[in-house]
Interface confidence: medium
């Protein structure tokens, strides 16, 4: 059982990807804190020479959907929708391999950004993955 909340996204940083859709938050005040973190991360990303175009085109919306997951509207209790594991793995191991290595070894980035761990996501063919968020 989850004990979080579903609330409309009210932020700026991810508005172009999420709009005013309902997102899952673990606490009522968490959205503002995460918004500040992702804004700082995006400021860093925007000026970073370490981020390739190939990576950025999927990494930026992925980070938004990871930070502010859509609520699972098929669930009777507030529950987040996961990123799709196959896309997460392509991002980490192919499109953004160099960037992930750099980010995971850079404490300044890790302070601002919680990167998704693909191994925590449900397997592609499992029932839990049926409603995953595709980028």
């Amino acid at each position: 059982e989850e004990d979080g909340f579903c609330q409309p996204y009210r932020g700026i940083a991810c508005a172009r990807f999420i709009g005013n859709r309902t997102v899952y938050m673990e606490s009522l005040h968490m959205q503002g804190e995460i918004e500040n973190q992702i804004t700082a991360a995006f400021t860093m990303i925007g000026t970073s020479s370490h981020l390739s175009d190939k990576c950025s085109q999927f990494a930026i919306p992925s980070l938004c959907h990871y930070a502010f997951p859509y609520c699972d509207e098929t669930s009777s209790v507030p529950k987040p929708r996961d990123l799709c594991r196959d896309e997460c793995e392509i991002l980490e191991n192919v499109l953004c391999q160099t960037e992930y290595i750099f980010a995971r070894s850079n404490p300044m980035i890790l302070m601002r950004l919680k990167l998704p761990n693909c191994e925590d996501l449900p397997q592609p063919e499992s029932p839990e993955a049926a409603n995953c968020i595709r980028i």
């Epitope: 700026i12 508005a15 172009r16 990807f17 709009g19 995006f42 990303i45 925007g46 981020l51 175009d53 190939k54 950025s56 085109q57 999927f58 930026i60 919306p61 980028i135």
Partner: antibody, heavy 121, light 107 residues
């Protein structure tokens, strides 16, 4: 060199349709927000729509919502604006423009030369 | 929707003059404001982004500033090639909005 080239403008009757194209080159098309902005004769700039080609995230101005559709073909590095149910007030030069920053929210640094759409009977 | 109210709508100035154009946002847009220059029959050109950052290749006589929801474009010493129409734009929200424009004419 970054370039955006619009095409597809012309004269169309009220209620008619037109599809504008914006061919991009010199940058990774799928990594940047692409905008359509229009300018009626003798008037100011009006933002119309944008697309994030990777994943096809889109957004529209209220004045065109439901009538215009923005799309992109990443294999051709081209953005499109399909305009249906055209009205006289849609008469304008239509520009496509690229957002400067890959993250978005940064201003439009490269613009096409514009293509004129005239809606008249 | 956020409105950007630009003033004046037009102004006459001489070469060498200091010119100031103002834009007021109807609500907070942080520093997410850009300024563009447009000449007749041409596409707009980006001058300033993030309220005060000078875009690459733009002469240093152009500058931008912010005070709350008021944004200012200043041309410190007007040059002949600066006679044009100038627009502000907010991009804080997905629906980006432009000011009405300020036409800078020769006195």
């Amino acid at each position: 060199e970054v370039q955006l080239v619009e095409s597809g403008g012309g004269l169309v009757q009220p209620g008619g349709s037109l599809r504008l194209s914006c061919a991009a080159s010199g940058f990774t098309f799928s990594s940047y927000f692409i905008h359509w902005v229009r300018q009626a004769p003798g008037k100011g700039l009006e933002w119309v729509a944008w697309i994030y080609p990777s994943g096809s995230y889109t957004y529209y101005a209220d004045s065109v919502k439901g009538r215009f559709t923005i799309s992109a073909d990443t294999s051709k590095n081209t953005a499109y604006l399909q305009m249906n149910s055209l009205r006289a007030e849609d008469t304008a030069v239509y520009y496509c423009a690229r957002e400067m920053d890959r993250v978005g929210y940064s201003g439009m640094d490269y613009w096409g030369q514009g293509t004129l759409v005239t809606v008249s009977s | 929707d956020i409105q950007m109210t630009q003033s004046p709508s037009s102004l006459s100035a001489s070469v060498g003059d200091r010119v100031t154009i103002t834009c007021r946002a109807s609500q907070s847009v942080s520093s997410a404001v850009a300024w563009y220059q447009q000449k007749p029959g041409k596409a707009p050109k980006l001058l300033i982004y993030s309220a005060s950052s000078l875009y690459s290749g733009v002469p240093s006589r152009f500058s931008g500033s912010r005070s709350g929801t008021d944004f200012t474009l200043t041309i410190s010493s007007l040059q002949p090639e600066d006679f044009a129409t100038y627009y502000c734009q907010q991009y804080r929200t997905p629906l980006g909005t432009f000011g009405q424009g300020t036409k800078v004419e020769i006195k």
